[in-house]
Interface confidence: low
């Protein structure tokens, strides 16, 4: 009884294919299948950043992978052939480990890179992201910022940078044509004459940076004696009504102060007759059914009632 | 937040070797340096070495070179520092500290862990 | 070694007086236009705490009292007006090479 071997696939590699982060892995099928034509073999592909605690691991037919990396760090992967029980009468059989790395040489030393990198996509319309040059980095330092997505062909240079004693500190981004709940991958690189500039990587996905605009058209009702509603609008925008929380501050008479979080466009509030003033301001944030995070709203304008009985009135502005 | 958590305190006998623990959290624990500085009673402050916690790259003062041993396990997020044939004079309180590049000194802390060294 | 000397050793000052401390190393701790000149603040029992970095950014949380300033081999921090809680011992640093080095430290005590 000869035991059955398998050798690992061949030339496997990592490819960047130029999209700031988003890499190929492809290999070929291993030499010496002759003797399992009738038999479908599968791959068992592991992957990491290197400093990672956990490898990421796929199981294929395929001989390729893709997938989002960070490249401020280097890659490892490796990866064997799995030849089914069906194929082998008796117990999976495994090859040896076939393993490649990947990283994109680091130029110049880390103080050189952007510092706080920070990027908002307002209303889920207009992407901007900002930075702070590296420490020390003289003024003909310039920074440039690249951008893909997966539907774009090409990274994209930024063509609208926000400028600073004539250096690139940020970015306003043209119109992004379906892109939000996709990795979207972001290098700053730079240039000097004087020494090298340490790129920097970024990948998030735009619909957990919204910053929404803030309500608007808050009102008061009256519902019973010691029960007052306050309602208020979604602003315009693209953002569905039910991707909203709100945040509600409301101040009685300059004392009491109320926060709650609430998920619709209404709070009812127990009161007092003696009550004599009421604010309130509202605030928004896109909520977990519709993306992972999210930036809260400036707050609204504030909304008062003073001096008058609340049941003969409602406020609306 | 960011928080070092250091061993606590040990005494040790002249000759012997003591290994101080410094347990990271609250931030990505291999993108940081961790530092290593001790300040004996009443003194000032001396850089012993740093080790990066990414690669296990280490850097250590050429005073201490042959006594030191600076190690990092990622999988629980500690820096180990072992100073061995200990002499009185090396009773101090150990510090590690937190940095990023060169240029962004020493960020955050541990509460330090004392060392005595006697017979 | 790079040597740093900080001047004065010690420090008496009243709550609302302006403090500065001065560093001088022994050589340049200039590179790539960086100053590598940090300062710290430490208080009995406690470990020292970032105030500056680079000569003259300030650490998170600081309070805008502190300040840097300095190139190459002379570095002052200054303590716009010093509060009760600003009466420590403090310590200049250079990071330019291995080994990194401390000053002495300046001991500020209330008049």
């Known amino acids: 009884d000869t035991e059955i071997k398998v050798n690992p696939p061949q030339d496997f590699e990592i490819v960047d294919p130029g999209y700031l982060g988003y890499l190929y892995l492809q290999w070929q099928p291993p030499l010496s299948l002759d003797h399992f034509k009738e038999c479908t073999v599968e791959y068992e592909l592991k992957y990491r950043n290197i400093g990672s605690e956990t490898w990421k691991t796929i199981i294929t037919k395929n001989l390729h992978y893709k997938d989002g990396f960070d490249l401020n760090k280097g890659i490892e992967a490796k990866i064997h052939t799995l030849l089914p029980w069906q194929c082998t009468n008796g117990s999976e059989v495994q090859s040896s480990w076939a393993e490649t790395t990947y990283w994109i040489s680091p130029q110049g030393i880390p103080e050189t890179k952007v510092q706080d990198m920070d990027c908002v996509y307002y209303n889920w319309q207009y992407l901007l992201c900002s930075w702070k040059p590296g420490i020390g980095v003289l003024l003909d330092t310039n920074y440039n910022l690249f951008y893909w997505y997966e539907g774009l062909d090409h990274a994209l240079q930024c063509v609208d940078y926000i400028k600073a004693d004539g250096q690139n500190i940020g970015c306003r981004f043209p119109y992004l044509e379906a892109s939000d709940y996709k990795d979207f991958y972001i290098c700053v690189n730079g240039s000097s004459e004087n020494k090298p500039i340490r790129s920097s990587y970024f990948t998030f996905q735009l619909q957990n940076i919204v910053k929404p605009l803030p309500p608007v058209y808050l009102t008061f009702t009256r519902e019973s004696s010691c029960e007052i509603k306050l309602k208020w609008s979604i602003p315009l925008g693209p953002i569905p009504a039910r991707c909203f929380d709100y945040e509600i501050e409301i101040r009685e008479d300059d004392t009491t102060l109320v926060t709650a979080t609430v998920e619709n466009e209404t709070y009812t509030l127990k009161t007092t007759n003696e009550t004599r003033q009421l604010c309130f301001v509202v605030r928004s944030k896109v909520n977990i059914y519709c993306s992972d995070d999210g930036i809260w709203s400036e707050w609204s304008d504030k909304q008062c009632w003073e001096g008058e009985d609340l049941s003969k009135k409602t406020l609306l502005r | 937040q960011v928080q070092l958590v250091q061993s606590g305190a040990e005494v040790v006998k002249p000759g012997a070797s003591v290994k101080v623990s410094c347990k990271a959290s609250?931030?990505?624990?291999?993108?940081?340096?961790m530092n290593w500085v001790r300040q004996a009673p009443g003194q000032g402050l001396e850089w012993i070495g740093r080790?990066?916690?990414?690669?296990?790259?280490?850097h250590y003062n050429q005073k201490f070179k042959d006594r030191v041993t600076m190690t990092v396990d990622t999988s629980t997020s500690t820096v180990y520092m072992e100073l061995s044939s200990l002499r009185s004079e090396d009773t101090a309180v150990y510090y590690c500290?937190?940095?990023?590049?060169?240029?962004?000194?020493?960020?955050?802390w541990g509460q330090g862990t004392l060392v005595t060294v006697s017979s | 070694d790079i040597v740093l000397t900080q001047s004065p050793s010690s420090l008496s000052a009243s709550v609302g007086d302006r403090a500065t401390i001065t560093c001088r190393a022994s050589e340049s701790v200039d590179n790539y236009g960086i100053s590598f000149m940090n300062w710290f603040q430490q208080k009995p029992g406690k470990p020292p705490k970032l105030l500056i970095y680079?000569?003259?950014r300030q650490g998170s949380g600081d309070p805008a009292r502190f300040s840097g300033s300095g190139s190459g081999t002379d570095f002052t921090l200054t303590i716009s007006s010093l509060q009760p809680e600003d009466f420590a011992t403090y310590f200049c640093?250079?990071?330019?090479?291995?080994?990194?080095?401390f000053g002495g430290g300046t001991k500020l005590e209330i008049k």
């Open positions: 640093q250079q990071s330019k090479e291995v080994p990194w080095t």
């Open positions: 500290a937190r940095g990023y590049g060169d240029a962004y000194g020493m960020d955050h």
């Open positions: 609250g931030y990505t624990f291999t993108n940081y340096w």
């Open positions: 680079a000569a003259s």
């Open positions: 080790i990066d916690a990414y690669a296990g790259e280490t």
